[in-house]
């Protein structure tokens, strides 16, 4: 089991439909080195990181997630659909594996909150 | 729909070898660890390999290492396992089963194909 | 190499009935732990990940517990086509299936 350190990170986010929002899981520890970094749905994997082979993003979201900042994950034109847990998953040397849980509730934009750019008036005439 | 397909199961003799194979697709293959995982008759599920997704780094279960290599070919979306030194206790189930991250739990499976070691 | 002990070997219960089934680690597994259903003939099924979450379409009868080396799968009302085999699965490391529970309905 893992016993030489923590991961932080915000259970839940939000952020609007169109927008992004950063995924950030924060390991820390005093003798553990990270070997390996897993960010996943219950069955979709978003991207690896490893330290022998740098980053790979899943193809499903090659155009919409971002290596970075760090370890995370800048995860752009969100949809609603994108709502959901997410899991990060560190796999450290010699500490063992360590995991963080978030959950990412996308919302409406403002404009279409405040009923902007619903409707378009014809012209008259 | 993820779909995975095993096939080339068969009736071989002890000390034999045979590769088995299982086609993927509905999903991006190579973005993805996969795993074999037997069922013996009047045995339990028994987890026999896994390979990473771009196929350098392979994990065994104890009583098939050595003996069985697992591998992948990501452009044809196909996975491997090349059994040898087969014996009886290798007579089973095999299936094709696909990891969320790395070596985790398995969501997607296939049907199986079925390996008889016998004289 | 860690060894996953499932118990009982099998049980026979009646619908509507409640039923607990128990795997244990031979060391600290944290949370690691996924559950299968398997019927024969069928490939198995996911049901929970990381010990208490629930695989999506899963129904809410089944649920799951336990951190370190014990762990429980508990089915609150049991339905017939809940008859099958119960696997426990270490999962990262070396992701070894605990023997399996067999679950049958009277």
């Known amino acids: 089991g893992a016993t030489a350190g923590t991961i932080d990170t915000k259970r839940n986010i939000s952020a609007e439909e169109g927008g992004s929002v950063i995924l950030q899981c924060h390991f820390s520890s005093d003798t553990a080195e990270v070997t390996q970094v897993d960010w996943k749905q219950q069955d979709q994997l978003l991207a690896i990181y490893s330290v022998d082979l740098g980053w790979h993003v899943a193809s499903v979201f090659s155009d919409r997630v971002v290596p970075g900042p760090s370890l995370g994950l800048t995860f752009q034109s969100l949809t609603m659909n994108d709502t959901g847990e997410y899991f990060c998953t560190y796999h450290t040397y010699p500490g063992g594996i360590y995991k963080g849980r978030i959950f990412l509730k996308v919302q409406e934009s403002s404009d279409d909150r405040n009923g902007l750019a619903q409707f378009q008036t014809a012209p008259l005439g | 729909e993820v779909q995975l397909v095993e096939s080339g199961g068969d009736l071989v003799q002890p000390g034999r070898s045979l590769k088995i194979s299982c086609v993927a697709s509905g999903f991006t293959f190579s973005d993805y660890y996969m795993a074999w995982v037997r069922l013996a008759p009047q045995k339990g599920l028994e987890w026999v390999a896994s390979i990473s997704y771009e196929g350098s780094r392979t994990h065994y279960g104890d009583s098939v290492r050595g003996r069985f290599i697992i591998s992948r070919d990501n452009p044809k979306n196909i996975l491997y396992l090349q059994m040898n030194s087969l014996g009886s206790e290798d007579t089973a189930t095999y299936f094709c089963?696909?990891?969320?991250?790395?070596?985790?739990?398995?969501?997607?499976w296939g049907q199986g194909t079925l390996v008889i070691v016998s004289s | 190499n860690i060894v996953m002990a499932q118990s009982p070997k099998s049980m026979s219960i009646s619908a509507g009935d409640r039923v607990t089934m128990n795997c244990k680690a031979s060391?600290?597994?944290?949370?690691?732990i996924a559950w299968y259903q398997q019927k024969p003939g069928q490939s198995p099924k996911l049901l929970i990940f990381?010990?208490?979450n629930r695989y999506s379409g899963v129904p809410d009868r089944f649920t799951g517990g336990g951190y370190g080396t014990d762990f429980t799968l508990t089915i609150k009302s049991v339905q017939a086509e809940d008859a099958a085999f119960y696997y426990c699965?270490?999962?990262?490391?070396?992701?070894?299936f605990g023997s399996g529970t067999k679950l049958e309905i009277k």
């Open positions: 089963a696909r990891h969320t991250g790395t070596l985790d739990w398995l969501v997607y």
């Open positions: 990381y010990a208490s």
């Open positions: 060391q600290n597994v944290d949370n690691n």
């Open positions: 699965q270490r999962i990262y490391n070396f992701p070894t």
